[in-house]
């Protein structure tokens, strides 16, 4: 059956029952979903806005799938196997009476046997599982995996220490508030602007305050933490995105087959190992890479480097430098350079700087 | 390259009875819901019933259930639909689709069958 | 029950254009929508699932938005291959279709 080809899962509540505190169907849920990460190199985020791996849903009745619950008792809940769209989501019956104790339905409970569905588990034939298909109260406080879940679990994902081969390391999501807070790339997509840090980014959407933490790898399984440059093409529905001497081509929020290629291919020198930042102007149809304290032009239409780069940043962009995290361009005539925990407001029909700003000004901090 | 082919299709008389086939090529076939969605000369798509993987849950549209029987032979990777008592509003063309899960069905049909026709008329 | 409402019925338009066809959903169906694209004497053709996604090998000139009850596919520069029907649809539910017709 499907598994999930990644180990870093998002997870979205979508609604909450009346029969309980939100805070206790989010721990529920949370505890759920730790039951299984504590013996697999699964790693579960939970997300409150945008696609997530694992849409939680509560519904009566017929709700959007072929499956339309049947009232109270009988079906209680069930979950669809890993996969895109539907897949993974765990559906929960507003008809039961979901309770955090041994009355009515017990949430945490239900939804362990129902992630582990969405996880790529059958039911188990072992009365002991919680995979076994019929729901019996056992005592929160002592609940344990039977030996017979752990094993179907583990012949799927492995056992917590394959964490360790995991390319991303496992470093918690950055406070996005903290003061120090700096960028690795940013980016607008659309009307959208996308934060990229270690292995998350927060998506901020133009004039609204709310922003959402996400894995870059829930987005993109194929891409790698760390993205170190990024920038748009709008008008091609394309983002371009760098790590070391690698690039990969977004095409409409999908990753494009046969990627990623060198960034040789753009016509840098052997020297240039990275890029720092990128930005596309679409006035002038070029893309400005930044090296070191230094960066080149790139024509998009052409597709070549233009003559006489590269040239100092601190030379042709008055006040910016020596070196640079990351920028991305906005409202026609502003580049935003971020520099560790500051960011410059940049216009660059005046070629000056018109404000300084924190690094993450954007998230309402 | 998955391949649906759909048979048995013609022509009928009201009350009368008929069985689909659709052959499947391409894909393993005892992994996936299966489904029949019919289209009415000139009219929109209509989905009409599904099958999950193994065989042992079945589901209908209410303006067929009790006249029609879906089933299918993963041993033959095939699909079927038996229809019994048959109704000038069951004229259509019959096509096979191909869910795009095992255990519980999406509802999302990735590959489609080009059809069969069925015509009830006396 | 569920029910899906696609609008409009049928569209004129030419080589070039942006169009778009609108799905509603009487109740929340979160982003569990899919369109078809089908043309005469033709089996329908999966072009996007999951309200957003872009099923393989679908030009990029197609895309889906909407989640809840309200649901959006546009395509973005018509080309004359893309005369067609086009349907949402939500499990056993098929909206009555939109053809879209060359002006």
């Known amino acids: 059956g499907p598994v999930w080809r990644k180990h870093y899962i998002t997870y979205r509540i979508n609604n909450y029952t009346p029969d309980m505190n939100r805070e206790d169907v989010d721990y529920a849920i949370r505890k759920a979903f730790q039951v299984w990460s504590n013996v697999t190199p699964l790693k579960f985020s939970k997300i409150n806005t945008g696609m997530a791996d694992i849409l939680v849903v509560f519904a009566r009745g017929a709700h959007g799938d072929f499956h339309a619950f049947d009232g109270k008792g009988g079906i209680l809940a069930h979950a669809f196997g890993p996969g895109s769209g539907i897949g993974g989501d765990a559906h929960f019956d507003e008809d039961e009476f979901w309770t955090t104790h041994s009355g009515g339905t017990n949430l945490f409970l239900t939804a362990v046997h129902e992630i582990g569905h969405s996880l790529g588990l059958g039911h188990s034939s072992d009365p002991k599982a919680v995979m076994f298909p019929t729901y019996k109260y056992v005592d929160i406080n002592t609940f344990r995996l039977s030996a017979d879940d752990i094993r179907g679990i583990q012949s799927l994902y492995g056992d917590p220490k394959e964490n360790q081969r995991l390319p991303n390391p496992d470093n918690s999501e950055p406070a996005l508030c903290d003061p120090n807070l700096s960028f690795d790339a940013v980016t607008t997509v659309g009307n959208k602007i996308f934060f990229f840090k270690d292995r998350f980014f927060w998506l901020k959407v133009s004039e609204r305050p709310k922003t959402s933490v996400n894995l870059i790898s829930s987005l993109w399984p194929t891409l790698p933490s760390g993205i170190e440059a990024a920038y748009e093409i709008e008008a091609r529905n394309q983002v371009f995105l760098f790590k070391d001497d690698k690039y990969w081509l977004i095409s409409n929020l999908r990753p494009e087959p046969n990627y990623p290629k060198s960034i040789h291919s753009f016509g840098f020198p052997n020297f240039v190992k990275k890029i720092d930042a990128a930005v596309f102007n679409p006035r002038f149809y070029r893309t400005y890479f930044f090296v070191d304290n230094q960066y080149w032009r790139y024509d998009e239409r052409r597709q070549m480097m233009d003559p006489g780069y590269p040239k100092l940043i601190t030379k042709n962009f008055q006040g910016i430098g020596p070196k640079i995290d990351a920028v991305f361009y906005s409202k026609n005539k502003y580049y935003y350079f971020f520099q560790g925990s500051n960011q410059f407001e940049y216009d660059f029909l005046l070629q000056r700087i018109t404000k300084t700003l924190k690094s993450n000004s954007w998230f309402g901090c | 390259e998955v391949q649906l082919l759909e048979s048995g299709g013609g022509l009928v008389q009201p009350g009368g009875s008929l069985r689909l086939s659709c052959a499947a090529s391409?894909?393993?076939?005892?992994?996936?819901?299966m489904h029949w969605v019919r289209q009415a000369p000139g009219k929109g798509l209509e989905w009409v019933s599904g099958?999950?993987?193994?065989?042992?849950?079945?589901i209908y549209a209410d303006s067929v259930k009790g006249r029609f029987t879906i089933s299918r032979d993963n041993s033959k990777n095939t699909l079927y639909l038996q229809m019994n008592s048959l109704r000038a509003e069951d004229t259509a063309v019959y096509y096979c689709?191909?869910?795009?899960?095992?255990?519980?069905?999406?509802?999302?049909?990735?590959?489609w069958g080009r059809g069969t026709l069925v015509t009830v008329s006396s | 029950d569920i029910q899906m409402t696609q609008s409009p019925s049928s569209l004129s338009a030419s080589v070039g254009d942006r169009v778009t066809i609108t799905c509603r959903a009487n109740?929340?169906?979160?982003?569990?929508l899919n369109w078809y694209q089908q043309k005469p004497g033709k089996a329908p053709e999966l072009l996007i699932y999951?309200?957003?996604s872009l099923q393989s090998g679908v030009p990029s000139r197609f895309s889906g938005s909407g989640s809840g009850t309200d649901f959006t596919l546009t395509i973005s520069s018509l080309q004359p291959e893309d005369f067609a029907t086009y349907y949402c649809?939500?499990?056993?539910?098929f909206g009555q279709g939109t053809k879209l017709e060359i002006k």
């Open positions: 109740q929340s169906i979160y982003t569990y």
């Open positions: 689709a191909k869910d795009i899960r095992g255990a519980y069905s999406s509802g999302l049909f990735d590959h």
């Open positions: 649809q939500q499990a056993g539910i």
């Open positions: 999951a309200a957003s």
């Open positions: 099958i999950v993987s193994s065989g042992g849950t079945t």
């Open positions: 391409g894909f393993t076939f005892s992994w996936y819901w």
